[in-house]
């Protein structure tokens, strides 16, 4: 002799975020005669998901016809399934009693697990350039996950780097979790080509991994190296001085030639050479009229990369080097002529 | 059409047992939900319980818990109900009876009853 | 559980005469759930209206039935030779299922 039970025969589901949930109960008997309802979670609190007999309850369909003589499967459907359906439902049989229903016996539960995919990891740098040498962090975030098992890899041009940490929040049970990662990077002289990557893997990616991406271009500022020659040229009273900036990154520079210390000339990078590494060169020149100038020149060459401090390089222009031509030139002008970069 | 048939009178003694049947015809037996109703001489009726022979599942009313045992053969057709430990006051005459339909709550069907003498 | 009390308990009437007898409920009832039997001496109980206020199959139609609630009423317009009986109401609104005690019609 036996009295009705309540079947649940799933003790846990996984269902996609989007997708529906079929959620199975069967009862043994039909009596006690009375209504079935669906609950989320067990106690005073429960959530009402489905009631056989009243409410509207506009994502849930039964499974079979509640009305068919003798129907004793009271397995529901849920569409449209979000994280925030996570949790255990049970199926409740109720008898009918006066003036309300009496909860009879419950299913032992069935645990909804909504897999839902992360969102795109967003990888951010420094907020200032670094240079060279330098150690810089790099954080990436992915958010809506679930379950809370993921993976998160960080690599440099496809070599993978180790020194990280990771946070998945909330500690505890949610409907969705979020992972937050910082990184720290060396950088070096040739990364301006170079890629940060965050690379997250998720039961819901199906081994396809979510990769997020930051372009070192964005946080390496490599100085320029300075070098000031002189050559000479068919006029025998000129000279030309010129000044390689090598290997710079990014591309704003201004440039300042100093006679003396005194401003000459100041110019703005404009049509660079690019290196294989990504960083530039320029080159700029003066025609220094040697007859007039009575003293050996400094001429300097100094050079502000992308709002930093200026560096600079002197070179000494000896004008005893050059006696045919004191005194030889009597006419005014500029002891400087300007030159155009080449 | 459908007929309930309850078996004959019965007279035990006190602390006897007794096994009463109602065998059920003109219907699927196992697919309606048959029920005891108890009535002692000139009084009114007290419902005992009730069993689905489908899945030969009881509930009773508490009153009767320990005292009633129902069962049901399906290959017979046929419902019993048990009674223990017999006393006078169990001495009543019994009637089986059937829904008219699952949710439809009255007794639309009747057997004929039994008549229980519980006597030394 | 839910009691039911019918009144009166007995009553004689002439026939061709109305008659009303009621069943109070100790918990409201839905009126689907309410229902009348007719028992006459030595025999099984015989439905009557069910839900209320719906004649069963045979039954004539002088008998009706109304009510909501927890109160409720039968009523047999002209009383006939015939409808000397027991009548009971009976809940299907909650376990137990329950009886009233009965009203005993006797015709004069």
């Known amino acids: 002799e036996e009295e009705l039970q309540v079947i649940q025969p799933d003790k846990s589901i996984s269902v996609a975020a989007g997708e529906s949930a079929t959620l199975h109960c069967t009862v043994t008997s039909l009596i006690p005669v009375g209504p079935i309802q669906w609950f989320r979670g067990a106690g005073p609190g429960r959530e009402l998901i489905y009631n056989q007999k009243e409410g509207h309850f506009p994502r849930v369909t039964t499974v079979s016809d509640l009305t068919k003589r003798n129907n004793m499967d009271f397995s529901i459907r849920i569409s449209n399934i979000t994280p925030a359906d996570a949790g255990t439902y049970y199926c409740v049989k109720f008898r009918k009693g006066s003036p309300d229903h009496v909860e009879f016996k419950s299913g032992a539960g069935t645990e909804l697990s909504v897999r839902a995919k992360p969102s795109a990891p967003v990888v951010s740098g420094p907020a200032a350039r670094a240079t060279p040498q330098h150690t810089v962090s790099f954080t990436c975030e992915s958010h809506g996950f679930s379950p809370r098992d993921i993976t998160l890899k960080w690599f440099k041009n496809g070599n993978e780097l180790s020194d990280f940490q990771t946070n998945v929040d909330p500690a505890g049970d949610s409907v969705s979790y979020s992972i937050h990662s910082t990184a720290k990077v060396v950088l070096t002289r040739e990364d301006v080509h170079s890629q940060v990557i965050c690379e997250v893997a998720h039961v819901t990616l199906q081994g396809d991994p979510l990769r997020g991406t930051a372009n070192l271009s964005e946080t390496i500022r490599v100085p320029p190296t300075l070098e000031v020659t002189q050559q000479p040229v068919r006029a025998e009273n000129q000279v030309n001085v010129t000044c390689q900036v090598r290997k710079f990154y990014p591309q704003r520079l201004q440039l300042t030639w100093l006679e003396n210390g005194n401003v000459s000339r100041t110019e703005t990078a404009s049509t660079l050479t690019e290196n294989k590494d990504g960083t530039y060169n320029w080159m700029s020149w003066l025609l220094v009229n040697v007859s007039a100038h009575r003293d050996d020149v400094k001429l300097t060459c100094q050079v502000e990369h992308d709002g930093q401090p200026a560096v600079s390089k002197s070179h000494d222009l000896k004008v005893s080097a050059h006696p045919k031509e004191q005194g030889s030139n009597t006419a005014p002008g500029p002891a400087l002529a300007s030159a155009a970069p080449l | 059409q459908v007929q309930l048939q309850q078996s004959g009178p019965e007279l035990v003694k006190p602390g006897a047992s007794v096994k009463m049947s109602c065998k059920a015809s003109?219907?699927?037996?196992?697919?309606?939900?048959l029920s005891w109703v108890k009535q002692r001489t000139g009084q009114g009726l007290e419902w005992i319980g009730e069993?689905?022979?489908?899945?030969?599942?009881?509930y009773y009313n508490e009153k009767f818990k320990g005292k009633a045992t129902l069962t049901a053969d399906k290959s017979s057709n046929t419902a019993y109900i048990q009674l223990t430990s017999l006393t006078s006051e169990d001495s009543a005459v019994y009637f089986c009876?059937?829904?008219?339909?699952?949710?439809?709550?009255?007794?639309?069907?009747w057997g004929q009853g039994t008549l229980l003498t519980v006597s030394a | 559980e839910n009691v039911l009390t019918q009144s009166p308990e007995k009553m004689a009437v002439s026939l061709g005469q109305k008659v009303t007898m009621t069943c109070s409920a100790s918990?409201?009832?839905?009126?689907?759930?309410l229902h009348w039997y007719q028992q006459k001496s030595g025999a099984s109980p015989k439905p009557l209206i069910h839900?209320?206020?719906n004649l069963a199959s045979g039954v004539p139609a002088r008998f009706s039935g109304s009510g909501s609630g927890t109160s409720y009423s039968l009523t047999i317009s002209s009383v006939e030779a015939e409808d000397a009986a027991t009548y009971y109401c009976?809940?299907?609104?909650?376990?137990?299922?329950?009886f009233g005690g009965g009203t005993n019609l006797e015709i004069k």
């Open positions: 009876g059937r829904f008219y339909d699952y949710d439809g709550g009255w007794f639309a069907y």
């Open positions: 003109g219907y699927t037996f196992s697919e309606y939900v």
């Open positions: 069993i689905y022979p489908g899945t030969i599942t009881t």
């Open positions: 918990s409201s009832v839905s009126s689907s759930d």
């Open positions: 839900g209320t206020s």
């Open positions: 009976q809940q299907w609104s909650g376990y137990p299922w329950t």
